[in-house]
């Protein structure tokens, strides 16, 4: 059970089943796919959300990377292994015993191998670049208004501490949101930048994970901001290990 479940729904994750089966008849919500009880006062980890979504259609993307170490989720959806707290396990394997190492946002960071592959630690993704293109508008958005609105969105909707939104860049029609969060900066209770980015990505695609809320209605000074393309780049604290340039 947790905060904000008193009517036995999970405001921050619609991909749950909730029932009043907790202490004193209080509500508990469990993620679909894994059955893991989730904390509905904050964002659910991306690993549990991916597990819940495992039957969804594959959504592979190939991107141009901003630097040689940036990772992109080219492998699309897979059914991940999560630890008891919902984080990605460092090593992921499929049904045919093909294994690979992932970072904290679940993106592959090594070549694929067999069951003997070792992934010593879950490497943290400390820098995420969200690259958006908005639909044409009458004129460019005011940069400072756009900056303020996006920071407000991450603070209020995704509960991400403002210090983790490093920058908002704008060159019409491209918007770039930089999220940075080192292991040493992330305190107990802080939303992970990877989870915030995933919720944002689903929001802009019209697939909101929030229970009962309308879709994302982003406005800058009353002018709708409609996103027509999203690319996300991930940078890890330790560079990935691939045998050749991809």
């Amino acid at each position: 059970h947790t905060a904000a479940q008193d009517n036995c729904t999970c405001p921050t994750n619609k991909m749950t089943v909730c029932s009043p089966d907790g202490p004193g008849g209080r509500c508990q919500c469990r993620a679909l796919g894994s059955g893991v009880a989730v904390d509905c006062s904050t964002l659910t980890s991306e690993c549990l959300l991916l597990k819940a979504r495992m039957s969804a259609p594959k959504n592979a993307r190939t991107l141009v990377r901003p630097n040689e170490h940036a990772l992109v989720d080219n492998d699309g959806l897979y059914d991940p292994d999560c630890d008891p707290e919902g984080r990605f396990k460092a090593r992921q394997c499929n049904q045919t015993s093909v294994c690979w190492c992932v970072n904290s946002v679940g993106v592959r960071r090594t070549d694929k191998g067999d069951l003997s592959l070792r992934c010593d630690e879950l490497v943290r993704t400390h820098h995420i670049l969200i690259d958006l293109r908005h639909r044409p508008t009458a004129g460019a958005f005011n940069h400072s208004d756009l900056d303020a609105e996006l920071r407000r969105l991450f603070r209020e909707r995704y509960r991400l501490h403002p210090k983790f939104v490093a920058a908002v860049h704008y060159e019409q029609p491209t918007i770039q949101i930089e999220l940075r969060q080192n292991t040493s900066q992330k305190a107990a209770g802080d939303v992970d930048i990877g989870d915030a980015a995933y919720y944002f990505e689903r929001d802009v695609k019209g697939e909101s994970l929030f229970q009962g809320r309308g879709g994302l209605d982003l406005r800058v000074r009353g002018e709708p901001l409609q996103v027509e393309r999203t690319l996300i780049y991930y940078l890890d604290e330790i560079p990935p290990k691939f045998s050749m340039k991809r």
Partner: antibody, heavy 123, light 112 residues
């Protein structure tokens, strides 16, 4: 690591009230219910009530409903219990304790405890 | 309110002994979803109580495997194998299935 910090002692006068604090650290304060437990000298443990730090929802033991008020300050990750109209019967050690989480199945159990605040009601 | 009765009140032991503490409730602690919220605590003098077992039989992290729990419905048992000096103190069972949550009266484990 999870810590619940409580002041060691409070000396208060009969008829007055006292507000006990419990500062939480090392975990997401709003994700775990907080319980308060009373222990009178040489006696057993009594459950006073619980509070959901995310929305302030409370459940009380009927016995303490008119005596105790539970609140939280999310900004400082602190839980409070105000005890009113104090009598000698209220002299006791008061513990704040965190309810476990469903991640590990310890829901409904008190997995971390403060050191307790000893309240002495005396004129 | 659910009344939780613990027996015995006092349990004199020698180191190395195996002992059992009983905990009985006035009504079933299993809710309509099949969950039983029954936990056990050890309270040593001058310390805060510490969680030993939750959900009847699950050991909390760091609790030695000489502690085990069993039971269902209204009858529960805590077993301690090979008593050690650090096991001495007051043992309490606690139910959080029904409001208000209630503790057993306690069992004092002391040296003979």
């Amino acid at each position: 690591q999870v810590q619940l910090q409580q002041p060691g002692a409070e000396l208060v006068k009969p008829g007055s009230s006292v507000k006990l604090s419990c500062k939480a650290s090392g975990y997401t304060f709003t994700s775990y219910w907080m319980y308060w437990v009373k222990q009178r000298p040489g006696q057993g443990l009594e459950w006073i009530g619980e509070i959901n730090p995310s929305n302030g929802r409370t459940n009380y033991n009927e016995k303490f409903k008119s005596k105790a008020t539970l609140t939280v300050d999310k900004s400082s990750s602190t839980a409070y219990m105000q005890f009113s109209s104090l009598t000698s019967e209220d002299s006791a050690v008061y513990y704040c304790t965190r309810e476990g989480h469903n991640y590990d199945g310890s829901l409904g159990a008190m997995d971390h405890w403060g050191q307790g605040t000893s309240v002495t009601v005396s004129s | 309110d659910v009344v939780v009765t613990q027996t015995p009140l006092s349990l004199p032991v020698s180191f190395g002994d195996q002992v059992s503490i009983s905990c009985r409730s006035s009504q079933s602690l299993t809710n309509s979803y099949g969950n039983t919220f029954l936990s056990w605590y050890l309270h040593k003098p001058g310390q805060s109580p510490q969680l030993l077992l939750y959900g009847i039989s699950n050991r909390f992290s760091g609790v030695p495997d000489r502690f085990s729990g069993s039971g269902s419905g209204t009858d529960f048992t805590l077993k301690i194998n090979t008593i050690k000096p650090e096991d001495l103190g007051m043992y309490y069972c606690f139910q959080s299935t029904h409001q208000p949550y209630t503790f057993g009266g306690g069992t004092k484990l002391e040296i003979k």
